[in-house]
């Protein structure tokens, strides 16, 4: 399907003039190529009539021109002076008329209507209201006045001012008679609509004396304002529907063929399936405008788009609306990334966000979608370094890899932290995405022990085992804080022969803190990369404790039985002074050593990466 | 719609010590960041401290040790201690705050008017 999109359908009156917009993929190439508008003939073959290369056709010669907006991705044609006979089928393309990269449009050019003389014409879109002015004499200023509609050749009385209201327009229609002096009447029609359209005529008095005025109602459609934007990417619908209709429920609709219109959401709590996780209907204004915004877009949005306000939260006859006709375009410059990412209870997910590249500097931000209500998404870490409360230590938003993708790293998965979660910068709204994280049956494959109780002053050595897949991988521990988290520096010694043959189930990378400070406290991660490209990670928090007044003893991890002076911590860890040990029943590879002297030529934090039987009871 | 108002400006000797103060007002629920961000003309805004709703505060590498960023108990007032002012530290300073809006997925972004730094030397 072409790229291009434009109006399906113009239509105009004799006389007048049309602005016709297209829209483009806005890429170099297509930036700079020929942009044309061309009349469909019979043989099926489309002439030119205006190009972006200065070409205007003899029929257009001084009504006409094309305009392109290369940094907009749009062109328009302006066409003036319309006549019936430029009632036809064109198109708006790029390059050569017969590549089909372009967009059939419609132009229909009626003849305007016959009005008897001195008519006043009032243009009016659906929903809206209108005030009919109405003057008269003053010898009619005591006499009845009264609003007819002209249907064919005889005239419907509408309103008079004996109370008499015609039952198409009850509770939507007032005849207003000012006080002495002023020589006119107002009838006020609210909430127009379709059937309204039509001849007037306003009446005061009657016999040969009566005072008449034409007045011509056009009720229009409101033309749907064209929208384009890039598949996986995001769309704001802005209402404004006018403070009359504020305290009435607002909804957005998208029609279907059956020309009826599907609720997409609405303020009474309804929403669409298919737009879970990936619509928000914003609170509205003081002046009680509104917005719908909608992420992760799909060839399947396209479609044309109405908001409104009913008190049934649905389109009904007669209330405001406002129209989009929304193209998806799937030349889109925004990467694909999984919309979709699993993890296991325990264990964690990397998320890749994709933000326009040219924007590296915005900030960046990771929200988690609620469906309550018109929807909201909370806040829950940004790169500026602020993570909310009940994430801390489990959740980290790092610039890498960059150019034009951050990554959000979330682990301790449980099943809460399951649904649909945004990704958003404050720079450009339409690269906002969504992702949904589910939380699948299994084991984390990083293991690591509970929570750790350090010694000050000792040596603290943190095991976290990885399987044989990730041999390949780089292994690396770091420690958490707001803005990220810090890799600590590696002893990794290389790969032995086993581990490039990887023939043990399990391998080990291990921590050391060399001696342990006050400032040790805190969470630490294990985890794996390739690159920039960040895998797993498991979490451990390490607590600082004084030394107690015995001196460390080596329990070894085989030991199953509490040793006296063990205190349980949660779920199967145990600890010995500064010693984690995992409950063997639960763990049985687990080796933490905690040496009580300093370690010779050791630096401070380091990680080592050896497989598990070469991991002796010291640290190397 | 959210206020900020500063004060505290004015002129201080080289090495001498001011202190600003910002405070919000209007309908404000919860405010996600407060900083001081300064401008030197012909410059773009730059950062000198933050604190976060979580009281974690952070410091440009020139403000570190010299300027200290404290907050009221309701959390909408902010107060930058400048000491050992130097005169590379004479600009407009503005006081900015975000606020997270759950509704709309955005953060709003509000500034002060500003107010002058002048460190004679």
């Known amino acids: 399907k072409s790229p291009v999109f434009g109006p399906q359908e113009v239509s105009s009156v004799e006389g007048n003039s049309v602005s016709i917009k297209c829209y483009y993929p806005p890429t170099s190439v297509n930036r700079h190529t020929r942009k044309y508008w061309c009349r469909k003939g019979a043989s099926g073959r489309c002439i030119t009539l205006v190009s972006s290369e200065g070409y205007v056709s003899s029929n257009y010669a001084g009504r006409a021109n094309l305009t392109n907006f290369p940094e907009n991705g749009t062109f328009v044609v302006n066409i003036a002076q319309l006549s019936r006979d430029d009632s036809g089928h064109y198109k708006c393309g790029l390059g050569i008329n017969s590549r089909g990269l372009s967009f059939d449009v419609s132009l229909e050019v009626s003849q305007g209507p016959e009005l008897p003389n001195g008519t006043e014409v009032y243009t009016v879109d659906v929903g809206r209201t209108v005030t009919i002015k109405c003057p008269f004499k003053t010898e009619n200023a005591p006499k009845t006045k009264a609003l007819y509609k002209k249907i064919g050749q005889t005239s419907v009385l509408v309103i008079d001012s004996r109370n008499y209201v015609n039952p198409n327009y009850k509770d939507r229609i007032r005849l207003r008679i000012p006080g002495t002096g002023q020589l006119i009447f107002t009838v006020v029609i609210d909430r127009l609509r379709l059937s309204d359209h039509g001849l007037y005529l306003c009446q005061a008095g009657d016999g040969s004396n009566r005072d008449e005025k034409n007045a011509d109602l056009q009720v229009l459609e409101p033309e749907p304002e064209l929208v384009y934007e890039d598949l996986r990417g995001s769309v704001t619908f802005h209402c404004a529907l006018g403070l009359e209709v504020a305290n009435v429920a607002k909804f957005l609709c998208r029609v279907n063929s059956r020309e009826t219109c599907d609720v997409v959401i609405n303020t009474l709590g309804k929403r669409d399936s298919a737009f879970e996780g990936r619509i928000l209907l914003n609170p509205q204004d003081k002046d009680g405008s509104f917005s719908v915004v909608i992420t992760g877009l799909r060839k399947e949005d396209e479609g044309r788009y109405l908001c409104g306000a009913h008190s049934d939260g649905q389109l009904q006859e007669g209330w405001p609306i406002q129209a989009w006709q929304l193209f998806v375009n799937e030349e889109s410059t925004i990467p694909r990334s999984p919309t979709v990412v699993k993890g296991v209870a325990g264990g964690s997910v990397a998320v890749l966000c994709p933000y326009n590249p040219k924007e590296s500097q915005s900030l960046k931000y990771w929200c988690l979608w609620e469906g309550a209500q018109n929807g909201r998404c909370p806040l829950l870490v940004e790169s500026q370094g602020l993570v909310q409360e009940q994430y801390e230590g489990r959740l980290s938003l790092l610039q890498e890899p960059g150019n034009g993708t951050f990554t959000v790293i979330l682990n301790q998965l449980t099943t809460q932290d399951a649904g649909f979660y945004w990704c958003l910068t404050n720079g450009d709204t339409r690269w906002r995405t969504t992702v949904e994280i589910k939380i699948i049956e299994g084991e984390p494959n990083l293991k690591v022990p509970g929570n750790v109780t350090a010694v000050l002053g000792e040596t603290l050595n943190i095991p976290c085992h990885f399987p044989c897949k990730f041999s390949s991988y780089e292994k690396y521990w770091c420690k958490w804080s707001n803005t990220g988290c810090q890799t600590l520096p590696s002893q990794d010694e290389g790969p032995s022969e086993a581990f490039v043959n990887c023939d043990e189930n399990s391998r080990l990378v291990s921590l050391t803190l060399n001696p342990v400070t006050r400032a040790d406290e805190g969470w630490y991660w294990c985890g794996v990369k390739q690159g920039h490209f960040y895998g797993e990670t498991a979490a451990v928090y390490v607590a600082v404790e004084e030394k107690k007044v015995a001196g460390s003893r080596y329990v070894s991890p085989a030991k199953a039985d509490a040793a006296p002076d063990e205190k349980v911590l949660d779920s199967g860890v145990r600890e010995i002074e500064n010693k984690a040990i995992q409950d063997p029943r639960l763990f049985a590879e687990e080796k933490v050593v905690a040496d009580t002297g300093d370690q010779a030529g050791g630096s401070r934090a380091s990680v080592d990466s050896s497989s598990s039987e070469e991991q002796g009871g010291s640290s190397k | 719609e959210v206020q900020l108002v500063e004060s505290g400006g004015g002129l201080a000797q080289a090495g001498g010590s001011l202190r600003l103060s910002c405070t919000a007002s209007?309908?404000?629920?919860?405010?996600?960041?407060m900083a001081w961000y300064r401008q030197t003309p012909g410059n773009e805004r730059e950062l000198v401290a933050r604190?976060?709703?979580?009281?974690?505060?952070h410091y440009v590498d020139s403000a570190k040790g010299r300027f200290t960023l404290s907050r009221a108990q309701d959390k909408n007032t902010v107060d930058l201690q400048m000491n050992s002012l130097e005169p590379d530290d004479a600009a407009v300073y503005y006081c900015?705050?975000?606020?997270?809006?759950?509704?709309?997925?955005?953060?709003?972004?509000?500034w002060g008017q500003g107010t002058l730094v002048t460190v004679s030397s």
């Open positions: 900015n705050a975000q606020i997270w809006s759950d509704m709309r997925g955005r953060m709003d972004t509000y």
């Open positions: 209007g309908t404000i629920s919860k405010i996600d960041v």
């Open positions: 604190i976060f709703s979580n009281d974690v505060t």
